[in-house]
């Protein structure tokens, strides 16, 4: 019997999604206008190029990254894909809103989308602990509390430590992986009898994760170097993150053969790995000196991915009760963290050669930026898993989690899929 | 050899517009980032709004905010300020200059290394 | 803010001059010197607190990081008496200091 949306849910998610929209378009029309200044068409659209790979990474990339489910793939792509646009729609006015709103309209350029687009990412990265617990009406909820939470966090963060938009963008890693997993704890944990097949992962889906690896590899030099502010930055963290994601392949590959008592590589590991050393080298990509560096810490990060995904999931299955394919939260924390480690590393050499006496101090300024973006991640975070607890958004049974026949139509009724 | 030549001042009224330029040889503009600088009659320099490399993101000093807008067209070598409501108080020296970015151990350093000679704008009525 | 100190200074030719930045806050070594003659555009003399732009006299040195500069003139010559500006890059808007007037005395 195919399994429909509940009637409230109906009625309740396109009303939901509908207003919410038609205010943004309200919002858009009383506040927004385009930067008029642009000069150099050429420029336009070399400019645009990033935005563009960032979409590429963010629906393609991360879309299909959490497409592994056997019963949960359609859901995972397309609803990605939803929160892609909504959030991206919300992260411009917010941006707008907390930077350039004293002085009048909001000035849409190609860079407030290239960063909204960069926010609405933090929830891609985020959903993966809870993808296929909760309904499109609770994603809204948590899109809109996470750009929300993102967006004051990077204002606080530039505000009070001075941080460059590159800087304070790269807490995003950490910040979205804390906070998915917080939310993640709110929800219901157990799977009850007959659910275990639907969080296993199966050939064409794991295939399709695959695919959203590959494009999130290939694309992921874009990500690190799209905020930063001049070419020579650019060039070093587009060089710097490729030697760290290729050496990350190769870790991730051998190491998780490794890991397998029959030398078996696993498809869980290598669609999270092969990503390790992008996350890792984010934050100093632009100031790493040297390939070797970025190559090394790639290595670890990807040594760092297989440990993690071999050893975490039974803890975060019984505790945050997330699936064993979805590891991207705590393998972007651990990576998040050891990436934000090598920045202060950085600070103390630079603070020491510089003869100033107040590496203590500067140090105290980078935990405190890093502690800032855990606290408000997991507050957020948790926040967001109260508000998807109530019962107004008829959340999935637990019986019906992982399943794409409560959400789509599908032309026949076969259960497998 | 490097410069910057800027052009485009003159004498206009409180509320008027007008738009400087500042055309770039001797070096690959769409390389560098690019400021506009100016200085009130007898007064210091005071930063106005720069511009990235590509043209992507732009900044303001408050004051100028909503009424100023600096662009770039990189296939002309040439830096724009648009300026509007213009008021008496921005009557200036207005000088471009070109930022350079020097690579730190934490952070990057940036700084003005080439300017232009100036243009005045006189704000009267 | 950037405070510069004196407001203005007399000095001999072959002394050794210095002018002082003080930042508000903490700016590392994100500061750079100007020289400005009047009627001319300012000239970059100093960045990054202490590294010499390309040909300016080696007589100019800055020192100083986090939030008390120096510009230090070793032998002053004829052709250096002019305004000197301090300028922070640390954080947005970028500021400079309010200009040291050097004069013959």
């Known amino acids: 019997m195919s399994s429909k949306y509940p009637r409230s849910v109906r009625r309740c998610l396109p009303l939901w999604a509908l207003t919410l929209e038609a205010a943004l378009i309200l919002l858009f029309y009383f506040f927004t206008h385009y930067d008029a200044s642009l000069e150099d068409q050429k420029g336009l659209v070399a400019s645009y190029q990033v935005g563009q790979d960032l979409t590429v990474m963010a629906a393609i990339g991360l879309g299909f990254l959490t497409s592994s489910f056997r019963r949960h793939s359609w859901s995972s792509v397309a609803f990605n894909l939803f929160m892609l646009a909504l959030g991206v729609q919300w992260a411009i006015l917010l941006d707008g809103f907390l930077s350039q709103f004293p002085s009048g309209k909001v000035v849409i350029t190609l860079f407030s989308i290239r960063l909204a687009t960069m926010s609405a990412l933090s929830v891609l990265i985020s959903v993966d602990a809870v993808l296929g617990k909760v309904n499109l009406a609770q994603l809204v909820v948590m899109v809109l509390v996470e750009v929300t939470a993102l967006g004051n966090l990077r204002m606080v963060i530039s505000n009070i430590f001075n941080t460059d938009y590159h800087m304070n963008m790269m807490h995003i890693y950490v910040f979205a992986a804390y906070f998915g997993l917080s939310v993640a704890w709110c929800l219901p944990k157990p799977l009850p009898e007959g659910t275990e097949d639907k969080d296993q992962t199966a050939t064409i889906p794991s295939l399709s994760a695959m695919l959203g690896a590959l494009f999130l590899w290939m694309f992921w030099p874009s990500f690190n170097s799209a905020l930063l502010r001049s070419p020579i930055e650019r060039k070093n963290a587009v060089f710097n993150t490729y030697y760290a994601v290729a050496v990350s392949v190769v870790t991730a590959i051998s190491g998780s053969s490794l890991a397998h008592p029959q030398g078996k590589i696993s498809k869980t590991y290598v669609h999270s790995a092969v990503l390790a050393g992008g996350v890792a080298v984010g934050t100093s990509c632009h100031l790493i000196p040297s390939p070797w560096l970025a190559m090394v810490l790639g290595l670890v990060a990807g040594l760092i991915s297989v440990g993690g995904a071999k050893y975490l999931p039974g803890c975060c299955n019984r505790v945050l009760g997330i699936p064993h394919s979805s590891i991207m939260g705590y393998n972007f924390s651990l990576l998040g963290l050891l990436g934000e480690i090598i920045y202060i590393v950085l600070l103390v050499l630079d603070t020491v050669g510089a003869g100033n006496g107040m590496i203590g101090f500067q140090v105290l300024l980078s935990i405190g930026e890093l502690s800032l973006a855990i606290v408000i991640a997991l507050m957020s975070g948790l926040l967001t898993g109260l508000l998807l607890n109530l019962k107004i958004w008829k959340a999935p049974h637990e019986a019906k989690y992982f399943d794409d026949q409560v959400f789509w139509k599908f032309p026949h009724l076969a259960v497998g899929f | 050899q490097v410069k910057l030549l800027e052009s485009g001042g003159g004498v206009v009224q409180p509320g008027g517009s007008l738009r400087l330029s500042c055309v770039a040889s001797?070096?690959?503009?769409?390389?560098?980032?690019m400021h506009w600088v100016r200085q009130a009659p007898g007064k210091g320099l005071e930063w106005v709004a720069f511009?990235?490399?590509?043209?992507?993101?732009?900044g303001y000093v408050d004051s100028v905010k909503g009424r100023f807008t600096i662009s770039r067209d990189n296939s002309k070598n040439t830096l724009y300020l648009q300026m509007k409501s213009l008021r008496a108080e921005d009557t200036a020296v207005y000088y471009c200059?070109?930022?350079?970015?020097?690579?730190?151990?934490?952070?990057?350093?940036?700084?003005?290394?080439?300017w232009g000679k100036g243009t005045t704008v006189t704000v009267s009525s | 803010v950037m405070t510069q100190s004196p407001f203005s200074l007399s000095a001999s030719v072959g002394d050794r001059v210095t002018i002082t930045c003080r930042a508000s806050?903490?700016?590392?070594?994100?500061l750079s010197w100007y020289q400005q003659k009047p009627g001319t555009a300012p000239k970059l003399l100093i960045y990054?607190?202490?590294r010499l732009q390309s040909g300016v006299p080696s007589r100019f040195s800055g020192s100083g990081s986090g939030t008390d500069f120096t510009l230090t003139i070793s032998t002053l010559q004829p052709e250096d008496f002019a305004t000197y500006y301090c300028?922070?890059?640390?954080?947005?808007?970028?500021?400079f200091g309010q200009g040291t007037k050097l004069e013959i005395k």
């Open positions: 200059a070109r930022e350079k970015a020097l690579r730190g151990i934490s952070r990057y350093n940036y700084y003005l290394d080439v």
């Open positions: 001797g070096f690959t503009f769409r390389s560098y980032g």
């Open positions: 511009i990235w490399f590509d043209g992507s993101n732009k």
């Open positions: 806050q903490n700016i590392r070594s994100f």
């Open positions: 990054a607190a202490s």
């Open positions: 300028q922070q890059s640390y954080s947005a808007p970028w500021t």
